[in-house]
Interface confidence: medium
Amino acid sequence: HRRLDKIEDERNLHEDFVFMKTIQRCNTGERSLSLLNCEEIKSQFEGFVKDIMLNKEETKKENSFEMQKGDQNPQIAAHVISEASSKTTSVLQWAEKGYYTMSNNLVTLENGKQLTVKRQGLYYIYAQVTFCSNREASSQAPFIASLCLKSPGRFERILLRAANTHSSAKPCGQQSIHLGGVFELQPGASVFVNVTDPSQVSHGTGFTSFGLLKL
């Protein structure tokens, strides 16, 4: 079968070559070809060219539509929900659950701890942390939430920080911290949230969340 296909391909190629040669001869006004033949061949050739050009136009239109749809500059957004963790780590844990957002694979939640972006650009990054603490049960130090940036080949830096003193309410008083700002992120950059005491963080619906949006 393969051999027959090859022969067929070669025959087609030969026919194409003869066709092109004939056009060439028509153009040079060779006498061995009748005018009728030449006209017929020329119109056939023009038809092919027209088809090719029309196809090109269609592709162009499709591509410009794709661009309009935003494929060249896709929306990049994420909103993740807090997740209680048995680990004593100061890094807050997040999950894609409830009413979360993960626009596409240009932003990912890595190990449940950090949002990582694949494209460079300006991003609005935010976090809301709700915590319940009591002055007597807590240390003297305030509750601090930090939004941190980790770039490839570079160690982390603090982007934003907020501190709240502990409540006198018993057993504990609920307070919320909101952090948000616009930052330039490099491809592969990650952002995460650190708190001084993760055991005090409230994980009820809507209390603690984290996200970003590419501007």
Epitope: V91, K113, P152, G153, R154, F155, S190, F192
Partner: nanobody
Framework: EVQLLESGGGLVQPGGSLRLSCAAS????????MMWVRQAPGKGLEWVSA????????YYADSVKGRFTISRDNSKNTLYLQMNSLRAEDTAVYYC????????????????WGQGTLVTVSS
């Protein structure tokens, strides 16, 4: 302040074993992919092994595959490299660093390096 402190190097006979440690501080160790690189006398940096932030995924250079084992203890902020069946060509200063998928491997690419630990394999 970020610090990476390598230890465990020394003189060992061919076929012997060593365990290197890298104590990390000043950054959130559990979020970082880490790696070991080495620099043999008069040579450039060579990537040896890497490990994912949670320790579940490991990578090795062909030259050390089956002989070296990378591991980490996030609760202790420490990275390890168990080196078995050591050869003369493993002689080098070993450094730990954050692993990222850069195309080059030069000290300039990273903010922090430890002082390294010298491993000498000789009879």
């Amino acid at each position: 302040e970020v610090q990476l402190l390598e230890s465990g190097g020394g003189l060992v006979q061919p076929g012997g074993s060593l365990r290197l440690s890298c104590a990390a501080s000043g950054f959130t160790f559990e979020l970082y992919r880490m790696m070991w690189v080495r620099q043999a006398p008069g040579k450039g940096l060579e990537w040896v092994s890497a490990i994912s932030s949670d320790g579940d995924t490991t990578y090795y250079a062909d030259s050390v595959k089956g002989r070296f084992t990378i591991s980490r203890d996030n609760s202790k902020n420490t990275l390890y490299l168990q080196m078995n069946s050591l050869r003369a060509e493993d002689t080098a200063v070993y450094y730990c660093a954050e692993h990222w998928l850069g195309t080059t491997l030069s000290l300039r690419d990273f903010d922090y390096w430890g002082q390294g630990t010298l491993v000498t394999v000789s009879s």
